[in-house]
Interface confidence: low
């Protein structure tokens, strides 16, 4: 037999064992020119001393072989004795170590068996009714194909699937979508209607994330508020990376899970923008306001479940003086200003009503006044902080008020609203004999004492009604009792108590008359 021809004799070996795990496989035969044909195959196992024979059976029942030696590719012409216009069955028998191994056969019409290309270029992936839809441009001059896919997960081997016949300029495939694991897909094509024709090579991997991106398992920590009124949010634990199939490890596009940080500033609701989304790698600085922070995981199919953390307000600011002056026209607040053209957000809320919405006012961008102060004023009619109760006031500042992460805390303090002078007056003042020349004066705590830092001191005044002499005794804001000494028996005294703030002198309580009885000796 000539080497260029298919030899119609018995091959020079005994038999073939098709039950072996090793041996020839993936035989593929197709036309490569008007009269030229090629068959190629893979050989699994040690290749030393292996001889390959391409076997061919014609529709007449006659069979022949090509001896290819150690080569796993053979080219032959339409003059080699193999019918190219009629159906033939081809397979490979590989002889080694006194045994013969056989490939699965292919049955085809060689002339019609054109080498089809796999899907090339961009394979678009989308979700359709809980399934995966892949779509791609049909390779040039190859309309009319049968398409298969294979897919695997990180823990499974390849599984084969069918996309069905395709007959258009674009081809598509519906594939299974896994809920919780990433998948690698590959596609291959062959000519439509030629059952035995060769499949194309497999396409490049298409990496597909799970339908549900993984729940982000992260942990945060937040630093204390610095002198600049800002604190840093830091990530203590990175989200775990998704396990990927073999062909999707490395820079495989399409399977990535991106994590984003969604920041929602709960304080100061009147500002322009309350929410900001930023990449998880870019951890922001925050003001001392209260925030909700969500970590959102998303993949090519959209966002997945998120986890939300609450970051409480940090009220431990540097001691900054807030002056509040109440005049006939209204009330004005003064505080040390920040830079030129700063917008301030003034927020207040009655103490004990933290669950309710705070009142909030945004100033126009303002420059410091000549004394270096910033101001905010409101009229009496507005009713702002008009009730006689304790308010928590926080002032935030930003040169870029629309940028959520550029706000800082200027101060956080308490203020007693309404007519604090009258409302703060101590009640239930009582006098008890203490000794022959002293008394104990007690009173109920001022309403101002419910407001942290507002009550500066109590002042107790004692007047000798005989001589009109007056003495005043300062008392710590935490005390509600004082002892008055060096009093004279039989003299009438009046005692009053007032509660002072840093900026306001309180109103005296109702005068309380008392005297120490003269002791009569026997």
């Amino acid at each position: 037999c000539r080497t260029s021809e298919c030899c119609f004799q018995d091959p020079p070996y005994s038999d073939a064992d098709s039950g072996s795990a090793s041996g020839p496989r993936d035989l593929s035969c197709y036309r490569i020119s008007s009269a030229g044909y090629e068959c190629s195959w893979q050989y699994e196992g040690p290749t030393a001393g292996v001889s390959h024979f391409l076997r061919c059976c014609l529709s007449s029942g006659r069979c022949c072989y090509f001896a290819t030696g150690s080569a796993t590719r053979l080219q032959f012409s339409d003059q080699a004795g193999v019918s190219v216009l009629h159906t033939v069955t081809l397979w490979v028998e590989s002889w080694a170590r006194n045994r013969t191994e056989k490939s699965p056969e292919v049955t085809l019409q060689l002339y019609k068996s054109v080498k089809y290309k796999p899907p090339l270029g961009d394979i678009k992936v989308s979700k359709l009714a809980g399934q995966l839809r892949m779509e791609w441009e049909t390779p040039d001059n190859q309309v009319g194909a049968e398409v298969q896919f294979r897919h695997r997960t990180p823990s499974s081997s390849w599984k084969l699937g069918d996309c069905g016949p395709q007959d258009d300029d674009t081809e598509s495939c519906l594939c299974p979508l896994e809920m919780n694991v990433a998948q690698e897909f590959q596609l291959r094509r062959r000519r439509l209607g030629s059952q035995g024709s060769s499949w194309s090579k497999w396409s490049s991997p298409v990496c597909v994330p799970p339908e549900n991106p993984p729940q982000p398992q992260v942990r945060f920590s937040v630093e204390q508020l610095g002198r600049d009124g800002r604190r840093r949010l830091t990530l203590k634990e990175q989200p775990t990376q998704l396990e990927l199939p073999e062909g999707c490890q490395g820079p495989a596009p399409g399977v990535e899970v991106t994590y984003q940080l969604q920041l929602h500033m709960l304080s100061c609701p009147c500002k322009a923008k309350a929410t900001r989304t930023l990449p998880l790698e870019k951890m922001p600085y925050l003001s001392g306001a209260a925030y909700n922070v969500a970590v959102i995981s998303s993949n090519r199919f959209g966002p997945g479940p998120n986890q939300t953390w609450h970051i409480p307000a940090d009220t431990h600011t540097e001691p900054v003086a807030l002056n509040i002056s109440v005049g006939t026209n209204g009330t004005t607040m003064y505080w040390p200003a920040r830079a030129q053209s700063t917008t301030y957000c003034i927020e207040w809320q009655p103490v004990g009503q933290e669950g309710s919405l705070a009142t909030c006012n945004l100033t126009a961008p303002q420059d410091p006044d000549p004394a270096g102060m910033a101001t905010y004023s409101w009229s009496r009619e507005s009713g702002a902080m008009g009730q006689e109760k304790c308010y928590h006031i926080t002032i935030f500042a930003s040169a870029h008020p629309k940028k959520l992460t550029l706000w800082s805390t200027v101060l956080s303090t308490y203020h007693f609203g309404g007519n604090a002078s009258a409302a703060g007056t101590p009640h239930h003042v009582s006098v008890k004999n203490h000794s022959l020349d002293s008394v104990s004066v007690d009173w109920a705590p001022s309403l101002l004492s419910t407001c942290p830092g507002v009550l500066k001191e109590y002042v107790v005044r004692c007047r000798d009604e005989d001589s009109n002499q007056v003495s005043e005794h300062p008392v710590q804001p935490t005390e509600t009792q004082v002892t008055l000494s060096d009093l004279r028996a039989g003299v009438a005294y009046t005692v009053q108590v007032r509660a002072d703030t840093a900026w306001l002198r309180g109103a005296w309580s109702q005068p309380q008359r008392f005297s120490i009885k003269v002791q009569v000796s026997d």
């Epitope: 018995d10 091959p11 070996y13 005994s14 038999d15 073939a16 064992d17 098709s18 039950g19 076997r55 059976c57 529709s59 007449s60 029942g61 069979c63 159906t87 033939v88 069955t89 397979w91 028998e93 013969t100 056989k102 699965p104 056969e105 049955t107 059952q195």
Partner: nanobody, 127 residues
Framework: QVQLVESGGGLMQAGGSLRLSCALS????????MGWFRQVQGKEREFVSG????????DYVDTAKGRFTISRDNARDTVYLQMNSLKPEDTAVYYC????????????????????WGQGTQVTVSS
């Protein structure tokens, strides 16, 4: 995809005869060596008989020699198993199988060697 369809099974008295047929479609029949196997529930499939592509060489399991005959008709794409002198121990599901390769060999007694299988036909022999 090659398809194999068996027929001819049934209920038969001991000593009787049956002829099983197996037709191949969607493939070139003459490219295949053909085999018959049988399986009793709960047991492995066992080789019964085989025939080469040309039909010139045949092979049988010892218990079938002299009683069973395998033949093929390449024009009709069909292989046959003529079973005479049936015994109750011949009761089983009979399967037809096809494989490309050089035949015969003890290799082909191994069910794993075969690529294509029919769905099976029941043969019951009563005493």
């Amino acid at each position: 995809q090659v398809q194999l369809v068996e027929s001819g099974g049934g209920l038969m008295q001991a000593g009787g005869s049956l002829r099983l047929s197996c037709a191949l479609s969607r493939g070139i029949f003459s490219a295949y060596a053909m085999g018959w196997f049988r399986q009793v529930q709960g047991k492995e499939r066992e080789f019964v008989s085989g025939i080469s592509r040309s039909g010139s060489t045949t092979d049988y399991v010892d218990t079938a020699k002299g009683r069973f005959t395998i033949s093929r008709d390449n024009a009709r794409d069909t292989v046959y198993l003529q079973m005479n002198s049936l015994k109750p121990e011949d009761t089983a599901v009979y399967y037809c199988a096809a494989v490309t390769g050089t035949f015969p060999s003890s290799t082909y007694h191994n069910a794993n060697a075969y690529h294509h299988w029919g769905q099976g036909t029941q043969v019951t022999v009563s005493s």
